[in-house]
């Protein structure tokens, strides 16, 4: 049925990166407001973004409670004013979101190269272990804390003077690679979860090159 003068939300879409998770929908409200509910398959519905005029709702606080659960959200449309003055008090219109499992579906954020250090013909490249909004014992967990060995990093590196790229992989946040003495190299990393079927890879990190301030060179 639904209340008079309201339209159901549509195009419900999950936008999630490193577990920061926002539900978006259309249309922009005209004479209506929205309320979002979220639930796990076995749990109770919880209301969020109550009577909002926005078309997005940050659900991070709910999904980080258990990132391996599968969540469903729904967006209710209510007339913009009390029902008696705007229409019949029937069941409100609502639309369901697609299911969302954060652990399997959150996008991997663009990684950052924290540092690199050359010792002779070896270079140690360290990837920043980004903090997420997932908590355990009142502490925010890092991406590595959450994904463990499911998360690997791929390093792309090449001589500044050429375009031929080499790759290395690690299931920690550090690479130790061999380089030619006297050559400057550039580096870029990518986060990967090989076991995933969707959203397997992040975008590449910004390129960092030797001879810039992030690096340290030591002749041994």
């Amino acid at each position: 049925s639904g209340t008079t003068n309201t339209v159901a939300a549509y195009n419900l879409t999950w936008k999630s990166t490193n577990f920061k998770t926002i539900l978006e929908w259309e249309p922009k409200p005209v004479n209506q407001v929205y309320t979002v509910q979220i639930s796990t398959k076995s749990g109770d519905w919880k209301s969020k973004c109550f009577y909002t005029t926005d078309t997005e709702c940050d659900l991070t606080d709910e999904i980080v409670k258990d990132v391996k659960q599968t969540y469903l959200a729904r967006v209710f449309s209510y007339p913009a004013g009390n029902v008696e003055s705007t229409g019949s008090a029937g069941e409100p219109l609502y639309e369901n979101s697609p299911e969302f499992t954060p652990y399997l579906e959150t996008n991997l954020g663009q990684p950052t190269i924290q540092s690199f250090e050359q010792v002779g013909t070896k270079v140690n490249v360290t990837v920043e272990d980004e903090r997420t909004l997932v908590r355990r014992n009142n502490t925010f967990l890092s991406l590595r804390d959450v994904f463990g060995k499911d998360l690997i990093y791929t390093l792309y590196y090449w001589k500044s003077s050429s375009s031929g790229k080499k790759t290395a992989k690690t299931n920690t946040n550090e690479f130790l690679i061999d380089v030619d003495k006297g050559e400057n190299y550039c580096f870029s990393v990518q986060a990967v979860i090989p076991s995933r079927t969707v959203n397997r890879k992040s975008t590449d990190s910004p390129v960092e090159c030797m001879g810039q301030e992030k690096g340290e060179f030591r002749e041994i």
Epitope: T35, Q37, S47, F50, T53, G81, N82, V83, A89
Partner: antibody
């Protein structure tokens, strides 16, 4: 005329429970969102909880989330507030209030019921 | 959460004189799509529940005397009692209904000088 009458207040020990009721008359109860607002002795107003006209959506202040539950029975024209794990800081006059021209604008209030949490 | 800050805490005004109460929100309560400010004013007399005076920042509730007026937009609002009457002695609260949780100002006590 519109009337909202709260009941169920009283003196209760910390950690115990209490259920407040708000009997509504003089308007089509099922058509209006309803709220609980409280006022500690000598203090200002604090919004506590809201329930939509249909009873589907509920929302709470952080200070009561997980301890208080708002509900309604549209067939009985009654609003409820179940208060569990009560604390000294929950001591207040509790008002039920009706959404007016817009959500969260209260055009009618009850007279309030006093809840005292003390050992 | 939107924090509402009222000033002054109390105000003593002579009968027939103007009383002005200010309310500031920590973020805008103006909704650009309809150009409305989601702000209300309430009056509370001792031993009574609050009474709605103004909504949408400047719209008087039905039955409210026209000596009460509201103004302002965005984050700064004012309630004015143009000519204070004895029955206006009360505590006045501003409240935002722009977003949940709903929040009230701390109140301003108006007395007769």
């Amino acid at each position: 005329q519109v009337q909202l009458v709260e009941s169920g207040g009283g003196v209760v020990q910390p950690g115990r429970s209490l259920r407040l009721s708000c009997a509504a008359s003089g308007f089509t109860f099922r058509s209006y969102g309803m709220h609980w607002v409280r006022q500690a002795p000598g203090k200002g107003l604090e919004w506590v909880a809201v329930i939509t006209y249909d009873g589907i959506n509920k929302y709470y202040a952080d200070s009561v989330e997980g301890r208080f539950t708002i509900s309604r029975d549209n067939s009985k024209n009654t609003l409820y507030l179940q208060m569990n794990s009560l604390r000294a800081e929950d001591t207040a006059v509790y008002y039920c209030a009706r959404d007016g021209v817009y959500y969260g604008v209260y055009d009618y209030w009850g007279q309030g019921t006093l809840v005292t949490v003390s050992s | 959460d939107i924090v509402m800050t009222q000033s002054p805490d109390s105000l003593a005004v002579s009968l027939g004189e103007r009383a002005t109460i200010n309310c500031k929100s920590s973020q805008s309560v103006l909704f650009s799509s309809n150009n409305k400010n989601y702000l209300a004013w309430y009056q509370q007399k001792p031993g009574q529940p609050p009474k709605l005076l103004i909504y949408w920042a400047s719209t008087r509730e039905s039955g409210v005397p026209d000596r009460f007026s509201g103004s302002g937009s965005g984050t700064d609002f004012t309630l004015t009692i143009s000519s204070l009457q004895a029955e206006d002695v009360a505590v006045y609260y501003c409240q935002q209904f722009h977003s949940y949780p709903l929040t009230f100002g701390g109140g301003t006590k108006v007395e007769i000088k």
